[in-house]
Amino acid sequence: LPRWRQQWSGSGTTSRFPETVLARCVKYTEVHPEMRHVDCQSVWDAFKGAFISKYPCNITEEDYQPLVKLGTQTVPCNKTLLWSRIKDLAHQFTQVQRDMFTLEDMLLGYLADDLTWCGEFNTFEINYQSCPDWRKDCSNNPVSVFWKTVSRRFAETACGVVHVMLNGSRSKIFDKNSTFGSVEVHNLQPEKVQALEAWVIHGGREDSRDLCQDPTIKELESIISKRNIRFFCKNIYRPDKFLQCVKNPEDSSCLSGI
């Protein structure tokens, strides 16, 4: 008889999840030779151990600590790029500017990017039918807790000048409820981080407003300043040109503003 399975509101575990995580890990050690000592089988075992057989609304950051330990990596000072609601452009940027890193350029972020997973209490099975939705079911689900855990660690280890890319097309350019606003901002270490520089990315070609004056950016400035970290803000009026100029900084058109 088929066993009763809890129905959650979110989509189920990504198909071929174990194979995908393992293949990504192996690929990462290939592309990032400095991580060649990483044992991908152990990484998968630790990942699995964080959520398998556990009630998927009762996952804790502690559950992910063995995985976090195995995936320990440091980013050079001044090379951390955070982002909020503008993942694709942030990733396009680090693909060109290879010495800067988003969380998804690090091993653990790379493993989990765009994947969903959850298990079931008291069984060794992965639930491919449904997983808890953050809003409709619970916030302490395997995916949300994972990103909270690794985002906290990523922010804690940042040093020098930290950059953040923000989406200027959104009603809340800085959103206190985003991972950046609720986790990363509060885990930057003032003794290691001298400044946070926000890049506000404009959406419309004709948008010439100074979005650094937006009330939510002022709110971000206030939070950061209270933490004894300096704050800077830049408008990126033309994201297409911005990327082009990162690729070809000598281009004559790059001497004017972007």
Epitope: A23, V26, K27, E30, P33, R36, H37, D39, C40, Q41
Partner: antibody, heavy 114, light 107 residues
Framework: QVQLQQSGPELVRPGTSVKVSCKAS????????VEWIKQRPGQGLEWIGV????????NYNEKFKGKATLTVDRSSTTAYMHLSGLTSDDSAVYFC???????WGQGTTLTVSS | DIVMTQSQKFMSASVGDRVSITCKAS??????VAWYQQQPGHSPKQLIY???NRYTGVPDRFTGSGAGTDFTLTISNIQSEDLADYFC?????????FGSGTKLEIK
């Protein structure tokens, strides 16, 4: 337990080619990259290249491009290194090794002589 | 390619002594350095990864240190079985490169 078992010694003529094998056991073959290293007496160690057994993708030391070709057979969990256009400079011990925990094969001695 | 220089070709020590084998990289390799021991007639055995992490089963007499361009393998309380060649290797960028080796002799 993890083992990398390499093929036996080879004595070959200059200008010919040879294929050295490295049979992996005791672990999931596609979960770890396999690298190849050359050691000539008194010459230290030289890194030849690495292969991802899952995808077949490779990275070579520029010095060994055109000389060494790395392949895998997933069904037999074996990695291979094909060496072509052999000269006396290719006489050496060749090792295969696994990423993570540094497991090495026992080495294959290649002698190129007329 | 990154050049790894082991300037000491030979080192001699008595049982119970402590020796430090050094390795210098031609450019910054972070901590992506491994140390290998090769006993006569054997395959190399990895002792240290990430400059200072010992592999399981490696005696704690072996200690790695350093970052950037300067690295050291220290062997304390030397035993007769430590007679071997010791190689450093950088794996920061392809192609990986090895030092030329340091032969440790036991007096």
């Amino acid at each position: 337990q993890v083992q990398l078992q390499q093929s036996g010694p080879e004595l070959v003529r200059p200008g010919t080619s040879v294929k050295v094998s490295c049979k992996a056991s005791g672990y999931a073959f596609t979960t770890y990259l396999v690298e190849w290293i050359k050691q000539r007496p008194g010459q230290g160690l030289e890194w030849i290249g690495v292969i991802n057994p899952g995808s077949g993708s490779t990275n070579y030391n520029e010095k060994f491009k055109g000389k060494a070709t790395l392949t895998v057979d997933r069904s037999s969990t074996t990695a291979y290194m094909h060496l072509s256009g052999l000269t006396s400079d290719d006489s050496a011990v060749y090792f295969c090794a696994r990423y993570a925990y540094g497991y090495w094969g026992q080495g294959t001695t290649l002698t190129v002589s007329s | 390619d990154i050049v790894m220089t082991q300037s000491q070709k030979f080192m001699s020590a008595s049982v119970g002594d402590r020796v430090s084998i050094t390795c210098k990289a031609s450019q910054n390799v972070g901590t992506a350095v491994a140390w290998y021991q090769q006993q006569p007639g054997h395959s190399p055995k990895q002792l240290i990864y990430s400059a200072s992490n010992r592999y399981t089963g490696v005696p704690d007499r072996f200690t790695g240190s350093g970052a950037g361009t300067d690295f050291t393998l220290t062997i304390s309380n030397i035993q007769s079985e430590d007679l071997a060649d010791y190689f450093c290797q950088q794996y920061s960028t392809y192609p990986f490169t090895f030092g030329s080796g340091t032969k440790l002799e036991i007096k």
